[in-house]
Protein backbone atom coordinates (compact mmCIF):
# COMPACT_ATOMS: atom_id res chain seq x y z
CA UNK A 1 0.00 0.00 0.00
CA UNK A 2 2.78 2.43 0.94
CA UNK A 3 4.56 1.85 -2.39
CA UNK A 4 1.35 2.40 -4.31
CA UNK A 5 0.62 5.55 -2.36
CA UNK A 6 4.04 7.05 -3.03
CA UNK A 7 3.71 6.26 -6.75
CA UNK A 8 0.29 7.90 -6.93
CA UNK A 9 0.80 10.75 -4.49
CA UNK A 10 4.11 12.63 -4.66
CA UNK A 11 3.13 14.39 -1.42
CA UNK A 12 3.75 11.19 0.54
CA UNK A 13 7.48 11.72 -0.07
CA UNK A 14 7.49 15.07 1.74
CA UNK A 15 9.09 14.57 5.18
CA UNK A 16 8.20 16.16 8.51
CA UNK A 17 9.28 19.80 8.52
CA UNK A 18 7.95 20.39 5.01
CA UNK A 19 4.62 20.70 3.24
CA UNK A 20 3.58 19.52 -0.19
CA UNK A 21 3.36 22.68 -2.27
CA UNK A 22 0.45 22.38 -4.71
CA UNK A 23 1.35 25.74 -6.26
CA UNK A 24 4.79 24.48 -7.23
CA UNK A 25 4.12 21.08 -8.80
CA UNK A 26 3.79 19.34 -5.43
CA UNK A 27 7.41 19.80 -4.46
CA UNK A 28 8.29 19.64 -0.77
CA UNK A 29 8.69 23.14 0.61
CA UNK A 30 10.10 23.94 4.06
CA UNK A 31 7.65 25.07 6.72
CA UNK A 32 7.69 28.85 7.16
CA UNK A 33 9.21 30.22 10.38
CA UNK A 34 6.94 29.76 13.41
CA UNK A 35 5.24 26.75 11.84
CA UNK A 36 5.87 23.01 11.83
CA UNK A 37 4.76 19.68 10.39
CA UNK A 38 5.27 16.70 12.65
CA UNK A 39 4.37 14.09 10.03
CA UNK A 40 5.22 13.58 6.39
CA UNK A 41 2.89 14.18 3.48
CA UNK A 42 1.18 17.28 4.88
CA UNK A 43 -0.31 19.86 2.51
CA UNK A 44 0.19 22.69 4.99
CA UNK A 45 2.26 23.31 8.09
CA UNK A 46 0.71 24.11 11.47
CA UNK A 47 1.17 27.36 13.37
CA UNK A 48 3.50 26.99 16.34
CA UNK A 49 1.97 27.41 19.75
CA UNK A 50 3.04 30.68 21.37
CA UNK A 51 3.76 30.58 25.09
CA UNK A 52 2.78 34.08 26.17
CA UNK A 53 1.65 35.80 29.34
CA UNK A 54 1.30 33.33 32.19
CA UNK A 55 2.59 30.56 29.90
CA UNK A 56 6.33 30.12 29.44
CA UNK A 57 8.19 28.08 26.86
CA UNK A 58 9.27 24.64 28.05
CA UNK A 59 10.35 23.50 24.57
CA UNK A 60 10.89 25.73 21.54
CA UNK A 61 8.97 25.07 18.34
CA UNK A 62 11.01 23.42 15.60
CA UNK A 63 10.12 22.71 11.99
CA UNK A 64 9.04 19.20 13.03
CA UNK A 65 7.48 19.69 16.48
CA UNK A 66 5.25 22.19 18.23
CA UNK A 67 6.32 24.34 21.13
CA UNK A 68 5.48 23.10 24.61
CA UNK A 69 4.42 25.47 27.37
CA UNK A 70 4.30 25.31 31.12
CA UNK A 71 3.23 27.95 33.64
CA UNK A 72 5.15 30.74 35.32
CA UNK A 73 5.90 30.32 39.06
CA UNK A 74 2.77 30.70 41.16
CA UNK A 75 0.65 28.88 38.56
CA UNK A 76 0.21 25.27 37.53
CA UNK A 77 -0.89 23.53 34.33
CA UNK A 78 -4.39 22.28 33.67
CA UNK A 79 -5.75 20.36 30.70
CA UNK A 80 -4.09 18.34 27.98
CA UNK A 81 -0.75 19.78 26.95
CA UNK A 82 -1.01 22.52 29.58
CA UNK A 83 -3.86 24.28 27.81
CA UNK A 84 -4.57 26.44 30.87
CA UNK A 85 -2.65 27.89 33.80
CA UNK A 86 -4.38 28.10 37.16
CA UNK A 87 -3.21 30.11 40.16
CA UNK A 88 -1.50 28.20 42.97
CA UNK A 89 -2.87 28.48 46.50
CA UNK A 90 -1.16 27.56 49.77
CA UNK A 91 -1.65 24.20 51.37
CA UNK A 92 -4.79 24.44 53.47
CA UNK A 93 -6.53 26.55 50.83
CA UNK A 94 -8.56 26.10 47.64
CA UNK A 95 -9.07 28.36 44.65
CA UNK A 96 -12.50 29.96 44.38
CA UNK A 97 -13.93 32.62 42.10
CA UNK A 98 -12.85 35.14 44.71
CA UNK A 99 -9.30 33.81 44.98
CA UNK A 100 -7.62 31.51 47.47
CA UNK A 101 -9.75 30.70 50.52
CA UNK A 102 -8.87 28.67 53.62
CA UNK A 103 -10.36 25.20 53.85
CA UNK A 104 -13.52 25.04 56.00
CA UNK A 105 -13.30 23.16 59.29
CA UNK A 106 -13.46 19.46 58.61
CA UNK A 107 -11.72 19.70 55.25
CA UNK A 108 -8.09 19.80 54.15
CA UNK A 109 -5.87 20.32 51.10
CA UNK A 110 -2.26 19.12 51.22
CA UNK A 111 -1.40 20.53 47.77
CA UNK A 112 -1.09 23.95 46.09
CA UNK A 113 -3.85 23.01 43.66
CA UNK A 114 -7.21 21.30 43.81
CA UNK A 115 -10.07 21.56 46.27
CA UNK A 116 -10.42 21.01 49.99
CA UNK A 117 -11.53 17.46 50.76
CA UNK A 118 -13.32 16.18 53.88
CA UNK A 119 -11.27 14.59 56.59
CA UNK A 120 -11.46 10.82 56.66
CA UNK A 121 -14.31 9.59 58.86
CA UNK A 122 -12.40 7.08 60.97
CA UNK A 123 -15.55 5.71 62.59
CA UNK A 124 -16.82 4.39 59.24
CA UNK A 125 -13.99 1.86 59.41
CA UNK A 126 -14.59 1.24 63.11
CA UNK A 127 -11.42 3.15 63.95
CA UNK A 128 -10.68 6.07 66.21
CA UNK A 129 -8.90 9.35 65.49
CA UNK A 130 -5.24 9.02 66.41
CA UNK A 131 -4.10 12.45 65.12
CA UNK A 132 -6.53 15.30 64.55
CA UNK A 133 -6.85 16.78 61.07
CA UNK A 134 -5.85 20.31 60.11
CA UNK A 135 -6.50 22.50 57.08
CA UNK A 136 -3.34 21.05 55.55
CA UNK A 137 -3.50 17.42 56.71
CA UNK A 138 -6.05 14.64 56.92
CA UNK A 139 -6.78 12.96 60.22
CA UNK A 140 -4.76 9.87 61.08
CA UNK A 141 -6.97 6.96 62.04
CA UNK A 142 -5.82 4.66 64.80
CA UNK A 143 -6.93 1.22 65.89
CA UNK A 144 -10.57 0.54 66.63
CA UNK A 145 -11.80 1.21 70.20
CA UNK A 146 -12.11 -2.56 70.72
CA UNK A 147 -8.38 -2.86 70.19
CA UNK A 148 -7.84 -0.35 72.98
CA UNK A 149 -9.66 -2.35 75.71
CA UNK A 150 -7.77 -2.74 79.02
CA UNK A 151 -4.89 -5.11 78.67
CA UNK A 152 -4.77 -4.72 74.93
CA UNK A 153 -1.90 -2.76 73.53
CA UNK A 154 -2.29 -0.66 70.43
CA UNK A 155 1.33 -1.22 69.57
CA UNK A 156 2.87 -4.65 69.54
CA UNK A 157 6.25 -4.49 71.34
CA UNK A 158 9.20 -5.96 69.54
CA UNK A 159 10.19 -9.46 70.59
CA UNK A 160 13.02 -9.39 73.13
CA UNK A 161 16.39 -10.15 71.70
CA UNK A 162 17.65 -13.59 72.60
CA UNK A 163 21.17 -14.08 73.81
CA UNK A 164 23.14 -16.68 71.91
CA UNK A 165 23.00 -20.11 73.46
CA UNK A 166 19.92 -19.43 75.58
CA UNK A 167 16.60 -21.07 74.92
CA UNK A 168 13.42 -19.12 75.63
CA UNK A 169 12.04 -19.44 79.14
Amino acid sequence: FERTRSLQDPCSNCPAGTFCDNNRNQICSPCPPNSFSSAGGQRTCDICRQCKGVFRTRKECSSTSNAECDCTPGFHCLGAGCSMCEQDCKQGQELTKKGCKDCCFGTFNDQKRGICRPWTNCSLDGKSVLVNGTKERDVVCGPSPADLSPGASSVTPPAPAREPGHSPQ
Epitope: N23, P32, P33, T44, C45, I47
Partner: nanobody, 122 residues
Framework: EVQLLESGGGLVQPGGSLRLSCAAS????????VGWVRQAPGKGLEWVSA????????YYAESVKGRFTISRDNAKNTLYLQMSSLRAEDTAVYYC???????????????RGQGTQVTVSS
Protein backbone atom coordinates in the same frame (compact mmCIF):
# COMPACT_ATOMS: atom_id res chain seq x y z
CA GLU B 1 -3.21 40.06 -7.80
CA VAL B 2 -0.22 39.43 -5.53
CA GLN B 3 3.10 40.08 -7.24
CA LEU B 4 6.66 40.03 -5.93
CA LEU B 5 9.59 41.31 -7.93
CA GLU B 6 13.10 40.56 -6.65
CA SER B 7 16.23 42.47 -7.69
CA GLY B 8 19.75 43.24 -6.52
CA GLY B 9 21.45 39.89 -7.08
CA GLY B 10 24.78 39.49 -8.84
CA LEU B 11 28.31 38.16 -8.66
CA VAL B 12 30.26 39.11 -5.57
CA GLN B 13 33.54 38.03 -4.01
CA PRO B 14 33.67 36.15 -0.69
CA GLY B 15 33.40 38.65 2.16
CA GLY B 16 31.49 41.10 -0.03
CA SER B 17 28.00 42.56 0.38
CA LEU B 18 24.76 42.77 -1.59
CA ARG B 19 21.35 44.26 -0.92
CA LEU B 20 18.34 42.45 -2.34
CA SER B 21 15.01 44.23 -2.88
CA CYS B 22 11.53 42.86 -3.28
CA ALA B 23 8.86 45.21 -4.61
CA ALA B 24 5.41 43.96 -3.64
CA SER B 25 2.04 44.69 -5.20
CA UNK B 26 -1.42 43.35 -4.43
CA UNK B 27 -0.80 43.34 -0.70
CA UNK B 28 0.88 45.45 2.00
CA UNK B 29 4.23 44.21 3.29
CA UNK B 30 3.73 45.93 6.64
CA UNK B 31 0.54 43.96 7.29
CA UNK B 32 1.77 40.50 6.31
CA UNK B 33 4.44 37.98 7.26
CA VAL B 34 7.08 38.20 4.52
CA GLY B 35 10.59 36.94 4.05
CA TRP B 36 13.27 35.43 1.89
CA VAL B 37 13.87 31.83 0.84
CA ARG B 38 16.72 30.58 -1.26
CA GLN B 39 17.51 27.59 -3.43
CA ALA B 40 21.14 26.57 -3.87
CA PRO B 41 22.11 24.58 -6.98
CA GLY B 42 20.79 21.02 -6.70
CA LYS B 43 19.19 21.65 -3.29
CA GLY B 44 15.74 22.31 -1.92
CA LEU B 45 14.30 25.58 -0.73
CA GLU B 46 15.58 27.03 2.56
CA TRP B 47 14.13 29.81 4.66
CA VAL B 48 16.71 32.57 5.12
CA SER B 49 14.91 35.34 6.97
CA ALA B 50 11.45 36.69 7.67
CA UNK B 51 9.59 39.52 9.35
CA UNK B 52 6.77 37.96 11.34
CA UNK B 53 3.69 39.61 12.81
CA UNK B 54 2.91 43.25 12.22
CA UNK B 55 5.00 43.82 15.36
CA UNK B 56 8.04 43.15 13.22
CA UNK B 57 9.75 40.27 15.05
CA UNK B 58 12.46 38.82 12.82
CA TYR B 59 13.62 35.30 12.03
CA TYR B 60 17.04 34.31 10.70
CA ALA B 61 18.37 30.90 9.74
CA GLU B 62 21.34 29.90 11.89
CA SER B 63 23.60 29.94 8.83
CA VAL B 64 23.02 33.67 8.20
CA LYS B 65 22.62 35.08 11.73
CA GLY B 66 24.82 38.13 12.27
CA ARG B 67 25.52 38.48 8.55
CA PHE B 68 22.11 39.16 6.97
CA THR B 69 19.57 41.81 7.98
CA ILE B 70 15.96 41.89 6.85
CA SER B 71 14.00 45.14 6.74
CA ARG B 72 11.06 46.74 4.99
CA ASP B 73 10.08 50.16 3.73
CA ASN B 74 6.36 50.51 4.28
CA ALA B 75 6.09 53.66 2.15
CA LYS B 76 7.68 51.88 -0.83
CA ASN B 77 5.96 48.55 -0.01
CA THR B 78 9.33 46.92 -0.42
CA LEU B 79 11.20 44.20 1.49
CA TYR B 80 15.00 44.17 1.70
CA LEU B 81 17.74 41.70 2.57
CA GLN B 82 21.13 43.23 3.38
CA MET B 83 23.74 40.50 2.98
CA SER B 84 27.30 40.97 4.22
CA SER B 85 30.32 38.73 4.82
CA LEU B 86 29.05 36.60 1.96
CA ARG B 87 30.34 33.03 1.60
CA ALA B 88 30.43 30.59 -1.31
CA GLU B 89 27.65 28.59 0.38
CA ASP B 90 25.34 31.63 0.09
CA THR B 91 25.26 31.10 -3.67
CA ALA B 92 21.62 30.51 -4.59
CA VAL B 93 18.53 31.96 -6.22
CA TYR B 94 16.84 34.17 -3.64
CA TYR B 95 13.05 34.49 -3.66
CA CYS B 96 10.79 36.89 -1.86
CA UNK B 97 8.01 34.98 -0.06
CA UNK B 98 4.70 35.79 1.55
CA UNK B 99 3.50 33.52 4.36
CA UNK B 100 -0.09 32.41 3.78
CA UNK B 101 -2.40 31.51 6.67
CA UNK B 102 -5.29 29.29 5.62
CA UNK B 103 -8.75 29.34 7.18
CA UNK B 104 -8.36 25.76 8.38
CA UNK B 105 -5.31 26.76 10.42
CA UNK B 106 -2.62 25.61 8.01
CA UNK B 107 0.41 27.64 6.92
CA UNK B 108 2.12 27.73 3.53
CA UNK B 109 3.90 30.42 1.51
CA UNK B 110 3.65 32.10 -1.86
CA UNK B 111 6.55 32.56 -4.25
CA ARG B 112 5.33 34.82 -7.05
CA GLY B 113 8.61 36.26 -8.33
CA GLN B 114 11.31 34.81 -10.58
CA GLY B 115 13.97 35.19 -7.92
CA THR B 116 17.34 36.89 -8.14
CA GLN B 117 20.60 34.98 -8.55
CA VAL B 118 23.37 35.56 -6.02
CA THR B 119 26.77 34.07 -6.85
CA VAL B 120 29.63 34.28 -4.38
CA SER B 121 32.91 33.41 -6.05
CA SER B 122 36.44 34.71 -6.36
Amino acid sequence: EVQLLESGGGLVQPGGSLRLSCAASGFTVSAEDVGWVRQAPGKGLEWVSAILDSGGSTYYAESVKGRFTISRDNAKNTLYLQMSSLRAEDTAVYYCARVVYHSGGGVTFDLRGQGTQVTVSS
